[in-house]
């Protein structure tokens, strides 16, 4: 039966389809060899012979079997806010990761084509939920008990301390003054550290409502047009080449 | 299960532009080419061509070059014959056919009448 | 272009009788030990329905009374015994290479 030809090419049987590793030639009408990754065709089979692979060249890929005629051209270099994570080689493209202490803004299908710096959260401000690599770092006002006295990505609010005598109040900004020599931390939300509390709370003012974040700039990385579908099922080519396999 | 279904009857005057189409289902329209096949009342069959269904490339046998256009709808899976300034001679059945070696898988067929 | 010629016209073949069409191609429709010939089944109103592919392939589905035999260039499609719902135009079609032809169709009557 035709379908039991061991070789490539060959006609397949009514309903049925290539076999692993295989294409249908819409040309040749025939089930033929796809190139192994690293590899692509050369030239496309006929119904005499096989497809011809060959190796990608350098700054090119293939990480599928395919039939493509040209080999991807692997992504630009990793801008200066990235980090390169894969390397470009003949079976796979180069991947750019955002550096630490920036996150992706806009993804591609591996790495990241837009990377930004993750949000600082001003002073009366803490981390609400932490900066991720497709995240921004979303900040909260501190509630009342609580504060943040930097521009920082990584703090939260943390509490007050308690005076057994105040010396200045404490608010979203600014921690309590105490003229206590052994002041002790109040149980606040947002606070991380829960100490037992003494009987008296400092006094603590709400912040004036302000921008929560301190002005960033991104950078846009080259953005190239999207490489051709590599190892689909369809047929990519349509012209006869005489080779061998 | 893999079907192709045509497009209704059409009655046309000579002069006139038809367009039949063939709407697949059941496997990946860009893996298989697509055939046309002209059938006359009371005749064989004859192979007009076919279409690229991956690159929309098409290839007309010698006596349907000119008027006759294949064409393409990707996104709906569907392949479309277009026939311009009918004749007399134009009349008969028109199939599409699944474009492999041994071809099972055939359209219902649409019959183009075409009359003054 | 390879000219398929199919033998009989017609012929007319009593209930449970064989019917055998021949068809010559111009040139051989071989390659690689496949024989690219294929025989169609057509009734009125209806697409042509695949019943022999590769010469003596029997398409899934299709009874055993068809059958298909050749090489090279001649080709034979035998039916036996033949049943009422026979009653149709057969074609040969050759794959080998484009264009894709048919023969001329061979009408089959039950007597």
């Known amino acids: 039966l035709p379908a039991q030809v061991a070789f490539t090419p060959y006609a397949p049987e009514p309903g049925s389809t290539c076999r692993l590793r295989e294409y249908y030639d819409q040309t040749a009408q025939m089930c033929c060899s796809k190139c192994s990754p690293g590899q692509h065709a050369k030239v496309f089979c006929t119904k005499t012979s096989d497809t011809v692979c060959d190796s990608c060249e350098d700054s090119t890929y293939t990480q599928l079997w395919n039939w493509v005629p040209e080999c991807l051209s692997c992504g630009s270099r990793c801008s200066s806010d990235q980090v390169e994570t894969q390397a470009c080689t003949r079976e796979q493209n180069r991947i750019c990761t955002c550096r630490p202490g920036w996150y992706c803004a806009l993804s591609k299908q591996e790495g990241c084509r837009l990377c930004a710096p993750l949000r600082k959260c001003r002073p009366g401000f803490g981390v609400a939920r932490p900066g991720t690599e497709t995240s921004d770092v979303v900040c909260k006002p501190c509630a009342p008990g609580t504060f943040s006295n930097t521009t920082s990505s990584t703090d939260i609010c943390r509490p007050h301390q308690i005076c057994n005598v105040v010396a200045i109040p404490g608010n979203a900004s600014m921690d309590a003054v105490c003229t206590s020599t052994s002041p002790t931390r109040s149980m606040a939300p947002g606070a991380v550290h829960l100490p037992q509390p003494v009987s008296t709370r400092s006094q603590h003012t709400q912040p004036t409502p302000e921008p929560s974040t301190a002005p960033s700039t991104s950078f846009l990385l080259p953005m190239g047009p999207s490489p051709p579908a590599e190892g689909s099922t369809g047929d990519h080519h349509h012209h006869h080449h005489h080779h061998h396999h | 299960q893999i079907q192709l279904v045509q497009s209704g009857p059409e009655l046309k005057k000579p002069g006139e532009t038809v367009k039949i189409s063939c709407k697949t289902s059941?496997?990946?329209?860009?893996?298989?080419?697509m055939n046309w096949v002209k059938q006359a009342p009371g005749k064989g069959l004859k192979w007009m061509g076919w279409?690229?269904?991956?690159?929309?490339?098409?290839t007309y046998a010698d006596d349907f070059k000119g008027r006759f256009v294949f064409s393409l709808e990707t996104s709906d899976s569907t392949a479309y014959l277009q026939i311009n300034n009918l004749k007399s001679e134009d009349m008969a059945t028109y199939f599409c056919?699944?474009?492999?070696?041994?071809?099972?898988?055939w359209g219902q067929g649409t019959l183009v009448t075409v009359s003054a | 272009d390879i000219v398929l010629t199919q033998s009989p016209a017609s012929l007319a073949v009593s209930l449970g009788q064989r019917a055998t069409i021949s068809c010559t191609a111009s040139?051989?429709?071989?390659?690689?030990?496949?024989?690219?010939m294929n025989w169609y089944q057509q009734k009125p109103g209806q697409p042509p329905k695949l019943l022999i592919y590769?010469?003596?392939n029997q398409e899934s589905g299709i009874p055993v009374r068809f059958s298909g035999s050749g090489s090279g260039t001649d080709f034979t499609l035998n039916i036996h015994p033949v049943e009422e719902e026979d009653a149709a135009t057969y074609y040969c079609?050759?794959?080998?290479?484009?264009?894709?032809?048919f023969g001329a169709g061979t009408k089959l009557e039950l007597k």
């Open positions: 279409i690229h269904t991956y690159t929309g490339e098409p």
């Open positions: 590769g010469a003596s």
């Open positions: 040139q051989s429709v071989d390659y690689g030990g496949v024989s690219y």
């Open positions: 056919v699944r474009r492999e070696r041994y071809g099972s898988f």
């Open positions: 079609q050759q794959s080998n290479e484009d264009p894709p032809t």
């Open positions: 059941g496997y990946t329209f860009t893996i298989y080419g």
